[in-house]
């Protein structure tokens, strides 16, 4: 679609006569008829296939024609066409004499023609005017012409329709050749596709307007490049949505089971060494001078009765000191200056000479010990309590204070964790060294088989169009992550294509 524009500039008819040579009365009141048609090797007046237009009376005999386009007038003359411009044309311009105001052919004199010109040739679409001048025996006409495209039509033939728009159907302006030029932030054939925030993940993110980054299910973060872990995941991460890959030292479905109690809680005090021994289970190895499950109790160094032969122990800041009884010496009063003649054995101990009487040895009755039978036997020195139990002296006997999960005189018996039937929903209980383990029936999971789980919801491949399926264990459902161009809970609907355009 376009317009053939004809600008009449000057008409000369000095003698004021018709084409016949007859003088006009009262003068040649001149108007023009223009006929635009398809190319003809010899132009004939037949149907004006591209259009026709007439002017009012523009002047008498000889006159210049005013450019009237700015005022909405009729010069340049407009011959619109609604087809592809063929690049060639024929043009007939007739000058007619109208004695009166009625310009209809039947109202004109029989020989009202003043002049007629016919031209034909090639003409490309463009803004530049072609100037021409045609002379006949009695007249001269100067004019210019061009072909331009109508609004919203572009290209060499005005055949490409392009209407700038900024709405749901596209965001573009039109280039001179009719191709679309997307507005900033838009892309695609019809500039319908927003350009998402720079860096927005190609698969996991999308946008409905430029510089936006909306995340698909299972993804989060400014650029939708962070997966959302399983709901309830405590100490875990994911590489795909709904995963819960436990951090080091954590276990269980939700990574909420502490496998590294030592690191996470540092239970051992006073510089003790901590060893993990199962879930929420640990053992503290105390430094000298400390005791207790967590080595929280400070031991007096004299508690171990290091002084022999009745020596008395004194605590000091950096250790202890033995005050030896007469006849003894040494760090622990272990050296005797006595002989059996000095009756050195206490508590009914019997004395035996050694080294020709230079030394002796005491043979102690039960419950006494020491080089002079001066000590009651400490039944805890041999560490009789197993499994980390604490040994306590109680008069002539001893007792073991057991750690949780153990019993028996020497804490040698493991309490059966399975005794209280901790596994729910018919789970099978297994005693372990440091606790128990439940083997769950189908449809249940968790440490105690307390979590109801469905068969993998993705097992039936419910997602269409190569979508990725994720099982949401917290809701026993699946989530389909659609590839670009598909929507719907199962990605079953293609996104509606834009309507076809006529170019």
């Amino acid at each position: 679609s376009g317009v053939f524009q004809l600008q009449l500039q000057e008409f000369i008819n000095e003698r004021g006569v018709l084409a016949s040579g007859r003088p006009c009365e009262p003068g040649c009141r001149t108007f023009f008829r223009v006929c635009l048609k398809h190319f003809q090797a010899v132009v004939s007046p037949g149907p004006c296939t591209f259009g026709t237009v007439s002017t009012p009376v523009l002047g008498t005999n000889s006159f210049a024609v005013r450019d009237d386009s700015s005022g909405g007038g009729r010069n340049p003359l407009q011959l619109p066409f609604n087809f592809t411009w063929p690049g060639t044309f024929s043009l007939i311009i007739e000058a007619w004499h109208a004695p009166g105001d009625d310009l209809r052919p039947e109202a004109l004199p029989p020989d009202a023609l003043i002049s007629k010109i016919a031209i034909q040739g090639s003409l490309a679409v463009g803004q530049n005017w072609l100037l021409d001048e045609q002379t006949s025996t009695l007249t001269r006409l100067r004019y210019s012409y061009r072909v331009i495209c109508s609004d919203n039509y572009y290209g060499d033939n005005c055949s490409r329709l392009c209407k700038k728009r900024n709405d749901h159907f596209g965001h573009y302006v039109c280039q001179p050749d009719g191709n679309l030029s997307c507005l900033p932030g838009w892309t695609g054939e019809y500039c319908q596709q927003p350009i998402c925030l720079s860096g927005c993940h190609e698969q996991n993110g999308y946008c409905s307007k430029p510089a936006e980054c909306l995340c698909r299910p299972g993804w989060q973060g400014r650029l939708c490049n962070e997966c959302i872990p399983h709901n309830g995941c405590r100490h875990g991460t994911c590489s795909t949505p709904w995963q819960c890959t436990c951090d080091e030292g954590w276990g269980g479905l939700f990574c909420d089971q502490d496998l590294n109690y030592c690191t996470h809680h540092s239970p051992c005090k006073n510089g003790a060494t901590c060893s993990n021994s199962g879930q929420r289970s640990y053992t503290c190895t105390c430094r000298p001078g400390y005791t207790g499950v967590d080595c929280e109790l400070e031991l007096s160094e004299c508690d171990s009765n290091p002084c022999r032969n009745g020596g008395s122990c004194k605590d000091q800041e950096d250790g202890y000191h033995c005050l030896c009884p007469p006849g003894y010496y040494g760090l622990h009063c272990e050296h005797s200056t006595l002989s059996c003649a000095d009756s050195p054995c206490f508590n009914g101990g019997s004395c035996r000479e050694r080294n020709q009487g230079a030394n002796y040895a005491c043979e102690c009755p039960p419950n006494f010990t020491g080089s002079n039978c001066e000590k009651k036997v400490d039944r805890c020195t041999s560490n009789p309590c197993a499994n980390g139990g604490q040994c306590l002296n109680r008069g002539p006997s001893r007792m073991c204070r057991c750690r949780p999960g153990f019993t028996g005189t020497y804490c040698e018996l493991h309490v059966s964790d399975c005794a209280r039937n901790p596994c729910a929903h018919g789970g099978t209980c297994h005693d372990l060294e440091n606790g128990l383990m439940c083997t769950c029936p189908a449809g249940f999971s968790g440490r105690r088989c307390e979590v109801r789980t469905s068969i993998d919801a993705c097992a039936s491949s419910p997602c269409f169009n190569r979508a990725t399926c994720y099982t949401d264990l917290s809701t026993d459902t699946f989530v389909c992550n659609c590839p670009y161009g598909f929507v719907g809970s199962r990605c079953e609907f293609p996104v509606g294509l834009p309507p076809s355009f006529p170019w």
């Epitope: 084409a19 007859r22 004939s44 037949g46 009202a112």
Partner: antibody
Framework: EVQLVESGGGVVQPGGSLRLSCAAS????????MSWVRQAPGKGLEWVAD????????YYADSVKGRFTISRDNSKNTLYLQLNSLRAEDTAVYYC????????????WGQGTMVTVSS | SYELTQPPSVSVSPGQTASITCSAD??????VSWYQQKPGQSPVLVIY???TRPSGIPERFSGSNSGNTATLTISGTQAMDEADYYC?????????FGGGTKLTVL
């Protein structure tokens, strides 16, 4: 139906006079130029005169100028040609014709009326 | 005075194309009309403004005009086309007719 019907022809002596009439019907007579064209026996067509729609403008062939007069009565839809000082060479069939405006030519013709100038 | 020159006669076989010319100085600058006249009948306008056919005139009649010559062309000539043909234009004194051409369909 568009129609032109001439009348008034006949035989007349040289120097004599005749008045030809042309009755128009089927179109708006007052809007059109009208003409008289004649054809001598065995000869070609010759334009005689024409008159504008309102009767203001009248044109004549050189051969009849000063002797013939064209006129019209739009109220009666009738065209006239007064023939005076007739000569032998004026002998012809006289046709009344509607002149199409704007160089269309003579688009409607009457059947003609014969004028014979003879002594 | 302005004279339009036509050949007195043209012959053509049925179904063939007949061309009748009309010549005058700078005739292409003017409009030419053509008339058909059969014996004993009034003339009938067959072409006006060089090449335009009035309604009712068969398509086999066509016209052209350029330079000094106007041409009436009858393609696929039929026996009923046998007639006298006159070209007509205008000069300063009024309408001018050519001398006429007798078309004979053999």
């Amino acid at each position: 139906e568009v129609q032109l019907v001439e009348s008034g022809g006949g035989v007349v002596q040289p120097g004599g006079s005749l008045r030809l009439s042309c009755a128009a019907s089927g179109f708006t007579f007052g809007n059109h130029w009208m003409s008289w064209v004649r054809q001598a026996p065995g000869k070609g067509l010759e334009w005689v005169a024409d008159i504008s729609s309102d009767g203001r403008y009248k044109y004549y062939a050189d051969s009849v100028k000063g002797r013939f007069t064209i006129s019209r009565d739009n109220s009666k839809n009738t065209l006239y040609l007064q023939l005076n000082s007739l000569r032998a060479e004026d002998t012809a069939v006289y046709y009344c014709a509607k002149a199409g405006g704007g160089n269309v030519g003579f688009d409607i013709w009457g059947q003609g009326t014969m004028v014979t100038v003879s002594s | 005075s302005y004279e339009l020159t036509q050949p007195p006669s043209v012959s053509v076989s049925p179904g063939q194309t007949a061309s009748i010319t009309c010549s005058a100085d700078n005739l292409g600058e003017k409009y030419v009309s053509w008339y058909q006249q059969k014996p004993g009948q009034s003339p009938v306008l067959v072409i006006y403004q060089d090449a335009t056919r009035p309604s009712g005139i068969p398509e086999r009649f066509s016209g052209s005009n350029s330079g000094n010559t106007a041409t009436l062309t009858i393609s696929g000539t039929q026996a009923m086309d046998e007639a006298d043909y006159y070209c007509q234009s205008w000069d300063s004194s009024g309408a001018v007719f050519g001398g006429g051409t007798k078309l004979t369909v053999l």
